[in-house]
């Protein structure tokens, strides 16, 4: 049942190129060498793709031609180390090219960037865009791969493949369209978002695998999949955790052909047995490739079993819970996570977690006891504060949304963390509070039993990226500790922490405050963000100011930014009432 | 290869006692959930009873609940059913199962064990 023992291929590039055909092939290498090289100009990167795609086509013809048996990494490495301005485009990354594999992959891994200084991609006109589309379809596509790619370097490859095929079915359907800005713009406008919520999901799964080990990644998806797929066996859940570990841990080290490959295979595989899966996959199942891979990694988790047993009888009242756990502790453990995680899809992943690391520490205790019946007879009790607090936390939090709407929310949110973190730059600030502040619209329209596995878990995800941004120029212990002691708890940890008394606030500098008429010309979304970037630079200077202080002082500027966009002379508005409005913001919270 | 090799089925009369026994091979026993189902002339398949992976949980059939009882020893891959005071109406043809609440009527049952219970 291994779907990936393979037989050893004398080339793997060749391999590669025939199971994922050629189209697949010189895509997953753009975006593996766009992930890597993630300043190099697009031009670059197509010169590079088709050496590689030409010498994968000598090895097909000759698998024992020369270099054809070289790794992947050997191959794409060597072929990176050739790019003429590394050193003065990338620094210290060109020292990468002086290691040997494996250590020079893992050098490149690790000059991954998530934060790359690139300019924000601005969307053409739609007439723009249909005629480069229609003057040559292949570019545009490779650029779309390529733009994505340098800007989230741990982008799910395959994943990537569908959001370009949906994006290719965009401008073939509008650009033929009589209203094409009507009928394409939404659909860019879904791919973005849901673009970039697939990027920070990825992104928390390989930091979950590089910052924590396989053991915790097999984990969150041993809970997952039990979750999904309650019906499943345990050997089933087991085979497919380790399928899809191996599929996620190649991605993630930048092996995206054998991802690719390995991805492909184990959504075959699953069609194959859906019968002993779930009764949900039946729709995905019937789909093309890309779109079955994606069907089946987002479907609703099937029914529970009718009638499953207490859950004590095998964890607490059996007389070899210390045996079997001594045994096989890992399968004991997994087989408690299978458990009670099918039993409760209204749970997150991460308090099943949080459960199955209290249930592991009793019996660390227990087991070495002297009556360890009597020691762990309890251990069921110790969840019942676990539950209650992400539920508490919810159902505080989503009382505030419904009365607040998600702006205002953002930004009881943004003051919230400001306080809790100073230290951390505003941009990242604005960043993660704004998409914490989403989970209202998010998961609060959910029912009860679908609200914490969808916030939770949602915030797991947001604050992996403050924690990946963080720790690219860390400013703050407070951030690195609930970053770095428990994935699971990063969420409680962040909650947890009270206003920061130690930061000294910083000096106010009248220039953060100054805005001018361009303000006016930007979108909904982009004038927030400007109000958003002050008012952390506000708590910055004043941490102990009131939320009462700070929504006067918000509202005044709301409402000048309002009166200088329909004033005739803009610019001299906002000069003017902007010294008188700094001024007051200055006498009103003491400044 | 899955194999499920039963054996201890026979006549037996109403109140009396039968133990029904299913030697496992060809795959992880204990990572399993078992069952008993059985099939009665001319009717379809009926779930008796499932026990969990590690033992302690049991369920049945409201039809066989206080008279049957399922249990495993993963040490030796067996899976058991001890029917007491047995009915007319128990007489049915007794697989054993891999897997529970549902998957067991897609598993390859292989060959019963038939059970007859008459005066």
């Known amino acids: 049942r291994g779907v990936f023992r393979r037989d050893a291929h004398k080339s793997e590039v060749a391999h590669r190129f025939k199971d994922l055909g050629e189209e697949n092939f010189k895509a997953l290498v753009l975006i593996a060498f766009a992930q890597y090289l993630q300043q190099c100009p697009f031009e670059d990167h197509v010169k590079l793709v088709n050496e590689v795609t030409e010498f994968a086509k000598t090895c097909v013809a000759d698998e024992s031609a020369e270099n054809c048996d070289k790794s992947l990494h050997t191959l794409f490495g060597d072929k990176l180390c050739t790019v003429a301005t590394l050193r003065e485009t990338y620094g210290e990354m060109a020292d990468c090219c002086a290691k040997q594999e494996p250590e020079r992959n893992e050098c490149f891994l690790q000059h991954k960037d998530d934060n790359p200084n690139l300019p924000r991609l601005v969307r053409p006109e739609v007439d723009v865009m249909c005629t480069a589309f229609h003057d040559n379809e292949e570019t545009f596509l490779k650029k779309y791969l390529y733009e994505i790619a340098r800007r989230h370097p741990y982008f799910y490859a395959p994943e990537l493949l569908f959001f370009a095929k949906r994006y290719k079915a965009a401008f073939t359907e509008c650009c033929q369209a009589a209203d094409k800005a009507a009928c394409l713009l939404p659909k860019l406008d879904e791919l973005r978002d849901e673009g970039k919520a697939s990027s920070a999901k990825q992104r928390l799964k390989c930091a979950s695998l590089q910052k924590f080990g396989e053991r915790a990644f097999k984990a969150w998806a041993v809970a997952r999949l039990s979750q999904r797929f309650p019906k499943a066996e345990f050997a089933e859940v087991s085979k497919l955790v380790t399928d899809l570990t191996k599929v996620h841990t190649e991605c993630c080290h930048g092996d995206l052909l054998e991802c690719a490959d390995d991805r492909a295979d184990l959504a075959k595989y699953i069609c194959e047995n859906q019968d002993s899966i779930s009764s949900k996959l039946k729709e995905c199942c019937e789909k093309p490739l890309l779109e079955k891979s994606h069907c089946i990694a987002e479907v609703e988790n099937d029914e529970m079993p009718a009638d499953l047993p207490s859950l004590a009888a095998d964890f607490v009242e059996s007389k070899d819970v210390c045996k079997n756990y001594a045994e096989a502790k890992d399968v004991f453990l997994g087989m408690f996570l299978y458990e009670y995680a099918r039993r409760h899809p209204d749970y997150s992943v991460v308090l099943l977690l949080r459960l199955a690391k209290t249930y592991e520490t009793t019996l660390e205790k227990c087991c070495a006891a002297a009556d360890p019946h009597e020691c762990y007879a309890k251990v069921f009790d110790e969840f019942k504060p676990l539950v209650e607090e992400p539920q508490n936390l919810i159902k505080q939090n989503c009382e505030l949304f419904e009365q607040l709407g998600e702006y205002k929310f953002q930004n009881a949110l943004l003051v919230r963390y400001t306080k809790k973190v100073p230290q951390v730059s505003t941009p990242t600030l604005v960043e993660v509070s704004r998409n914490l502040g989403k989970v209202g619209s998010k998961c609060c329209k959910h029912p009860e039993a679908k609200r914490m596995p969808c916030a939770e878990d949602y915030l797991s995800v947001v604050l992996n990226q403050l924690c990946v941004l963080h720790e690219k120029t860390p400013v703050s212990d407070r951030v690195t500790k609930c970053c770095t002691e428990s994935l699971v708890n990063r969420r409680p940890c962040f909650s947890a922490l009270e206003v920061d008394e130690t930061y000294v606030p910083k000096e106010f500098n009248a220039e953060t405050f100054t805005f001018h008429a361009d303000i006016c010309t930007l979108s909904e979304k982009e004038r927030q963000i400007k109000k958003q970037t002050a008012l952390v630079e506000l708590v910055k200077h004043k941490p102990k100011a009131t939320k009462e202080q700070l929504k006067a002082v918000m509202d005044d500027f709301a409402a000048f930014v309002e009166k200088c966009c329909k004033a005739d002379d803009k610019e001299t508005c906002f000069a003017e009432e902007g010294k008188k409005l700094v001024a007051a913001s200055q006498a009103a919270l003491g400044l | 290869e899955v194999q499920l090799v039963k054996s201890g089925g026979g006549l037996v009369q109403p109140g009396g006692s039968l133990r029904l026994s299913c030697a496992a091979s060809?795959?992880?026993?204990?990572?399993?959930?078992m069952s008993w189902v059985r099939q009665a002339p001319g009717k379809d398949v009926e779930w008796v009873s499932s026990?969990?992976?590690?033992?302690?949980?049991?369920t049945y059939a409201d039809s066989v609940k206080g008279r049957f009882t399922i249990s495993r020893d993963n040490a030796k891959s067996t899976l058991v059913l001890q029917m007491n005071n047995l009915k007319v109406e128990d007489t049915a043809v007794y697989y054993c199962a891999r897997g529970f609440s549902g998957n067991y009527y897609r598993a390859d049952l292989g060959q019963g064990t038939q059970v007859t219970v008459s005066s």
């Open positions: 060809g795959f992880t026993f204990s990572h399993y959930q």
């Open positions: 026990i969990s992976m590690l033992g302690g949980g049991t």
